[in-house]
């Protein structure tokens, strides 16, 4: 019996087609993805093959103005239109809190939404009961397939699930649910979830009874053969893991942003064992037409966004590099722009002694979610900025001891090289790292811009001095592992909306040209 699994993950609000780097589509003939194109391909496969499941492994939420404006209603509407069969909860589904998940998505979805390792407690337990499930058994042709969901246990550090959801260890939580499916005589089981490729492989290895793992979160691109676009494969598709009980378990993921549709064919024997698996992600490029009906619907929903988003705020005459390949590894000019805007937004309280009350900014590189191409006439719109800063956070003012700041910069590079989000972009700070030294001892120079001076200059950080710093509320709350900030901050004042801070700065400057200028070495 053959099953076709179509899968997406980390779509992050890319409902419309995008450019090749998943930013705003500029040249339509070279654009990719989007739900209208996805639907064309899905329908083509559904017509051609008998047993098809369309699955999403989480993080539909967050990423463009679509989410900023519609807050998840767009996800439910278009996933319903595409007839998804199931979805796993990703960490970003909690970005607007539990209510922001229940109302627009859980109550509106016409398909099951899954996670076995999220357990509700307190008053939320009854409120959310039945709205998401640990697993679901779906009929496919004359057979049934069990789908069990999971979500990154790091979600409380990455999003806003509140205090009444407990995120358990994935493997510990999945095993009893898979065992339950086995007792229900379900012998074909897919683990669908959002914990990253390393965890996906562990699930394949450790959870007895899981036949296939469909993952997300790490934006992993797997491919067999010559890859069709810029993404470099992290391994073959499917990636085969040998389980502890000796089975060959295929693990798949489909990069991100709706650029590819994962396509996996699995052959099962009559006992539900995987005999063979093959496939590849399908690049959703312009050779696949956009479905006219879905496109018309997109255009209808788009109207509300246009008023909100399309006015020019200012111009850039340089490429604003907000790629994860840059901002999670080194100084990037998008990080510099944002930090400059954050400081500019806090220019106040100057007196004879202080040119400003605050001179420093830190910003987690993982919070920068998209580049902006200057070749679109240099125009910068709210929509562009919403793709860069999609999380709807605020830029806050904190007071920290120098020793806390030093810890933060050590944390910034404690696992350097893994494309993790904690790498800090800066303003009013010069930092030098020696990556040959052991983690926790890599900051060799940390100079900060004086405030009590008429001519600003950089002085060495003093461990016992108290400094004011502007940073995202995400960091102030200990996000991305910056627990030392949350635990040791001496004062925290919430500030202005992140996109608004940057848009105001760009409007004020009119033309911008941020450089990479040696803030981080």
């Amino acid at each position: 019996w053959e099953l076709t699994i179509l899968h997406t993950n980390d779509v992050h609000s890319r409902l419309e087609q995008t450019s090749e780097d998943s930013s705003k589509c500029v040249n339509a003939s070279r654009c990719m993805g989007g739900v209208a194109r996805l639907f064309t391909k899905v329908q083509q496969i559904r017509r051609a093959e008998p047993n098809v499941l369309l699955l999403d492994a989480g993080d539909q939420y967050q990423g463009t103005i679509w989410f900023t404006v519609y807050k998840g209603a767009e996800v439910a509407h278009f996933m319903n239109a595409l007839r998804y069969d199931a979805m796993a909860l990703g960490n970003h589904e909690f970005d607007n809190g539990v209510e922001g998940l229940i109302e627009p998505l859980l109550k509106e979805a016409k398909f099951p939404i899954l996670s076995a390792n999220i357990k509700a407690k307190g008053p939320l337990a009854s409120q959310i009961s039945g709205l998401y499930l640990p697993y679901k058994v779906l009929p496919v042709g004359d057979e049934v397939v069990g789908i069990v969901g999971y979500t990154s246990k790091e979600t409380p550090f990455l999003s806003n699930p509140g205090t009444n959801l407990v995120f358990e260890d994935e493997i510990t939580a999945l095993q009893p649910e898979v065992d339950k499916l086995k007792t229900l005589n379900v012998n074909k089981i897919i683990a669908l979830g959002h914990s990253g490729f390393e965890t996906d492989k562990l699930i394949a290895q450790k959870v007895r009874g899981v036949d296939v793992v469909v993952g997300g979160h790490s934006n992993t691109f797997l491919y067999t053969g010559n890859p069709p676009s810029k993404e470099v494969p992290a391994g073959k598709y499917p990636f085969i893991v040998t389980s502890d009980d000796g089975r060959k378990v295929p693990v798949v993921q489909a990069y991100a942003f709706g650029k590819y549709l994962g396509y996996l064919k699995i052959e099962f024997d009559e006992r539900g064992n995987v005999i063979s698996s093959h496939g590849n992600p399908i690049l959703l490029n312009s050779s696949i037409p956009e479905d006219p009906s879905i496109k018309a619907d997109i255009n209808k929903w788009r109207i509300k966004l246009d008023n909100y988003s399309t006015q020019e705020l200012g111009k850039t005459i340089v490429y604003l590099d907000g790629s994860s390949q840059s901002c999670r590894f080194r100084e990037c000019n998008m990080g510099n722009l944002i930090c400059d805007a954050m400081i500019n937004n806090n220019l106040r309280h100057a007196d004879e002694m202080f040119w400003n009350h605050v001179s420093m900014c830190i910003l987690n590189g993982g919070g920068i979610r998209s580049p902006i191409d200057e070749r679109n006439n240099g125009t910068i719109t709210w929509e562009n900025l919403a793709a860069v800063l999609p999380f709807g956070g605020t830029f806050d003012l904190v007071q920290l001891k120098g020793s806390t700041l030093k810890k933060a910069f050590e944390h910034s590079v404690h696992r350097y090289g893994q494309s993790t989000g904690e790498f800090l972009q800066v303003g009013g700070i010069h930092v030098v790292y020696d990556l040959s030294r052991k983690p926790g001892d890599r900051v060799v120079k940390l100079d900060v811009l004086c405030t009590k001076c008429r001519v600003p200059s950089y002085d060495p950080l003093k461990m016992d001095e108290i400094y004011k710093v502007i940073l995202p509320n995400f960091l102030a709350n200990g996000g991305d592992g910056f627990q030392m900030i949350k635990d040791e901050l001496l004062r925290h004042d919430s500030g202005d909306q992140d996109i608004n801070v940057v848009s105001t700065y760009i409007s004020k400057m009119k033309v911008i040209y941020p450089a990479v200028e040696g803030r981080i070495k």
Partner: antibody, heavy 117, light 107 residues
């Protein structure tokens, strides 16, 4: 156990109004939409509309937008449908139903409305 | 509004017989179709949603299939308690619309 308990039969005069209730138990009332359906001999089954008990947001069938008003009382986990300017054509059995995944999963036992002078 | 045409309007069948009821939508309803059963003087009971997903507790002799505009409900081996009226309901778009019903009686 999920239950939707509707109010009893109503006999009302033409031109009057009536308010039918649907009390939910066994689940979180605010977590699921409540829909209302009319069943008559003339037109069989007709969908009237739905309400989100969390915030009171409604969607109506255009054919019923001047006839029916949907409300909820969260404190008592009760949904209400008020029918206005009643005529003999409104005589029917009215059902409330809980919807999940866009479809009905539990139904109330029905309320018979008779409009007669 | 989407028109749901259900057939037959009534049928007689014997115990153990395989019974199929169909519903045709006036446009593609994306598998967003539910089937429910109603017995005289009782409230409806949902059997199937999303065209083919059986509601928990519904006997496995009931099955649903279809896509696009055409859908069917099958009872593989008719039992006495299956007598009643069967309705389809599309929930692809508002307003939700129902089929006129199929009255299933014992031959």
């Amino acid at each position: 156990e999920v239950q939707l308990q509707q109010s009893g039969p109503e006999l009302v005069k033409p031109g009057a109004s009536v308010k039918i209730s649907c009390k939910a138990s066994g689940y979180s009332f605010t977590g699921y939409y409540i829909h209302w359906v009319k069943q008559s001999h003339v037109k069989s089954l007709e969908w009237i509309g739905r309400i989100n008990p969390y915030n009171g947001a409604t969607t109506y069938n255009q054919n019923f937008k001047d006839k029916a008003s949907l409300t909820v009382d969260k404190s008592s986990s009760t949904a209400y449908m008020e029918l206005h300017s009643l005529t003999s054509e409104d005589s029917a059995v009215y059902y409330c139903a809980r919807f999940h995944y866009g479809a009905p999963d539990y139904w109330g036992q029905g309320t018979t409305l008779t409009v007669s002078s | 509004d989407i028109l749901m045409t259900q057939s037959p309007s009534s049928m007689y069948a014997s115990l153990g017989e395989r019974v199929t009821i169909t519903c045709k939508a006036s446009q593609d309803i994306n598998t967003y179709l539910t089937w429910f059963q109603q017995k005289p003087g009782k409230s409806p009971k949902t059997l199937i949603y999303r065209a083919n997903i059986l509601v928990d507790g519904v006997p496995s002799r009931f099955s649903g299939s279809g896509s696009g505009q055409d859908y069917s409900l099958t009872i593989s081996s008719l039992e006495f308690e299956d007598m009643g009226i069967y309705y389809c309901l599309q929930y692809d778009e508002f307003p939700l619309t129902f089929g006129a019903g199929t009255k299933l009686e014992l031959k």
